[in-house]
Interface confidence: low
């Protein structure tokens, strides 16, 4: 789950084992970043996680920290001389000063842009130093596609129509699929173009040309490959003429799905009578349930928004019968039904539903306990995904894709904006090893966000520090035993030679000097020489 990088120059030869033992005990610097790319939505804030293992007695005055772009080495943010040196990256970065002393060198990148995508290196230097690179993958959800028909009236079976599916402000480039009412893919006569705007976000336009039958439904699906978010719309064409005279107010049958913070268009159209002028038009948008006024047009003039100043009509299109309402910076509280009421001579109304949605973040996975795990241990795996709407569906499965339903507790809490943070806890007994996946599904966006963790139980392994201590103590013990054996051997040898010397003294005087000198010839130390002479 974590990519670990030690400091450069950590290779140690066997001959320097004791030096390495000291090095490990004093604490090699380990810099850790997530292995998976950090996925961040355009306009939101992203945290590039980076942690290091502070030595005992570590103080911030010793810390040198640099965040830089991996490819260009451009400085992003730094901490030196006990002080945050600030952002060198458009004033959009910040560290977590209260957490630095605990080894948290993470970087907060604010108001993420497409141009931020790429690799960021976290470089930490205390006595030792190390670095690791984390990837930032930028994404932006595509808007619910809008569908247009050309021609859009007086249609008869056999006519050729061009259906355009447009989805806006997404990233990265989308995949577009067309299908008919039976779900059969339509691949012929499709032209798709994608254009990036100055922020790097893509607008996708896909055009399908079809020959009309008696009636037909055509669906367009725009997929964001990073968010695994599918945005779809469909249009049903019934070739027939609508009767003249009456005001026919038309709204989409399906709810309009709008992402929190984006703008939504509540479509409403009416059929203007011949000779119609805007001076005759009376248009009211109101909340269906409470009848609260949202926006109005009367006496030939737009009377403006009565709804937190976040609504607008399309004044240039009103004369053609387009009474659609633009709702800006959608909030969760906007969800519900809006009524479009049109009166000329005749009158009519229709209600359109607004379904608010927000994609869930990629889940973060945590383990408790998270070290010294062995088969048979019970672990708690927490899967957390943030700031989504509406409430999520959470699914757990093992590495073989088998659903895990027992011992799962899921809680969802709404914040003050009405967005949900979901926390799902799975309790499992570890096998030899296992992968556990958590899938957080947004039921409206049909967006699946998943995270997984692979746990390898290691019954006979030690943490590196314990291993080095064990090796060091073993070396010391062996050295002690060898020294002891050597001393014992010398003592035995000495006593044997003393006995031999005594026997030779009795045999003859002339041999004495030769025997006294002989141990000196083979001696290994002055101490031994002294003992031998004595």
């Amino acid at each position: 789950m974590l990519r670990r990088r030690g400091s450069p120059g950590m290779g140690v030869h066997v001959g320097a084992a004791l030096g390495a033992l000291w090095f490990c005990l004093t604490g090699a610097l380990e810099v850790q970043v997530p292995e998976d790319p950090v996925v961040a939505l355009v306009g939101t804030d992203a945290t590039l996680c980076c942690s290091f293992s502070p030595e005992p007695g570590f103080s911030l005055a010793q810390l040198n920290l640099i965040w830089q772009l991996t490819d260009t080495k451009q400085l992003v943010h730094s901490f030196a001389e006990g002080q945050d040196q600030g952002s060198a990256y458009a004033n959009r970065t910040a560290l977590f000063p209260d957490l630095l002393a605990q080894g948290n060198a993470s970087l907060r990148l604010q108001r993420v842009r497409v141009a931020d995508e790429g690799s960021f290196t976290c470089f930490v230097s205390i006595r030792d130093f190390g670095s690791a690179a984390v990837s930032l993958q930028v994404a932006a959800p595509y808007s619910k596609p809008s569908m247009t028909l050309e021609p859009n009236k007086d249609l008869r079976p056999g006519d050729t129509v061009t259906i355009t599916c447009s989805s806006y402000q997404g990233y990265p480039e989308a995949e577009v699929f067309w299908q008919d009412g039976q779900g059969v893919p339509l691949t012929g006569n499709v032209t798709t173009s994608q254009m990036a705007n100055e922020q790097g976000l893509f607008d996708v336009h896909s055009i399908l040309r079809v020959v009309l039958g008696a009636n037909g439904t055509y669906s367009c699906l725009v997929r964001n490959p990073v968010l695994q978010q599918d945005a779809h719309s469909s249009v049903t064409i019934t070739p027939q003429r609508s009767p003249t005279g009456a005001v026919e107010v038309q709204v989409p049958e399906d709810p309009v799905v709008a992402l929190v913070g984006t703008d939504a268009t509540l479509r409403c159209s009416f059929s203007p009578e011949p000779g119609f002028s805007l001076a005759q038009l009376n248009l009211i948008w109101q909340l269906t349930d409470t009848k609260q006024l949202v926006h109005s047009f009367t006496e030939g003039r737009d009377q403006g928004s009565a709804y937190a100043n976040r609504t607008a009509l399309f004044p240039d299109l009103l004369a053609q019968g387009n009474a659609s309402l633009r709702l800006q910076r959608v909030r969760v509280a906007d969800e519900g039904s809006f009524t479009c009421f049109v009166s000329i001579r005749d009158f009519g109304s229709a209600a359109v539903s607004l379904q608010v949605a927000a994609p869930y973040s990629k889940p973060s996975m945590t383990l408790e306990p998270n070290k010294d795990l062995r088969p048979g241990d019970t672990v708690t795996i927490t899967c957390s995904s943030y700031r989504g709407y509406p409430e999520a569906e959470v699914f757990w499965q093992d590495g073989q894709g088998v659903p895990l339903t027992g011992n799962v507790t899921t809680s969802q809490m709404a914040n003050e904006q009405g967005l949900f943070d979901v926390h799902s806890v799975l309790r499992v007994v570890l096998g030899a090893n296992g992968t556990y996946s958590c899938l957080v599904r947004n039921p409206v966006l049909q967006q699946d966000a998943h995270g997984s963790v692979t746990i390898t139980g290691q019954p006979m392994t030690f943490p590196p520090e314990a291993l080095w201590v064990t090796v060091g103590l073993s070396v010391c013990l062996i050295a002690l035993l060898v020294a002891l054996a050597f001393v014992c051997w010398r003592k035995i040898k000495q006593s044997c030679e003393e006995e031999n010397a005594g026997a030779e003294d009795q045999d003859g005087e002339g041999e004495g000097s030769k025997t006294a000198l002989q141990p000196l010839k083979h001696s290994d130390s002055k101490e031994d020489d002294g003992q031998e002479i004595a």
Epitope: N91, R92, R111, A308, N309, R310, Q328, R329, R331, E416, Q417
Partner: nanobody, 123 residues
Framework: QVQLQQSGGGLVQAGDSLRLSCEAS????????MGWFRQAPRQEREFVAA????????YYADNLEGRFTTSRDNAKNTVYLQMNSLKPEDTAVYYC????????????????WGQGTQVTVKP
């Protein structure tokens, strides 16, 4: 171009309260975060408080939190600064401003400024 019109300043006794108003025109007020700063005689302009576009988040200078409160009414395009338990050292010209990119407490983060309103607190 956003214009800011301030009102509500004046001369008060120590311990009194005062409410400053700042009305915005020429933009979508509900999409702006707003801030308050003050400048006492012969001193630097200093940060007082800031409020997010929807009013959900507020941010205060450490020494003022508890006595000063900022709020907004997006329907009236107006932001307010309620000042309680005023002290002589609160005497200053108070400015409201429209926040751009950056930290709330930094002057450089603000794009548009009001004309300022004088607040004088007598001991």
């Amino acid at each position: 171009q956003v214009q800011l019109q301030q009102s509500g300043g004046g001369l008060v006794q120590a311990g009194d309260s005062l409410r400053l108003s700042c009305e915005a025109s020429g933009g979508t007020f509900s999409s702006y975060a707003m801030g308050w700063f003050r400048q006492a005689p012969r001193q630097e302009r200093e940060f007082v408080a800031a409020i997010s576009s929807e009013g959900g988040s507020t941010y205060y200078a450490d020494n003022l939190e508890g006595r000063f409160t900022t709020s907004r009414d997006n329907a009236k395009n107006t932001v307010y600064l309620q000042m309680n338990s005023l002290k002589p050292e609160d005497t200053a010209v108070y400015y409201c401003a429209v926040k751009g990119v950056g930290w709330p407490q930094e002057q450089a983060s603000y794009d548009y400024w009001g004309q300022g309103t004088q607040v004088t607190v007598k001991p």
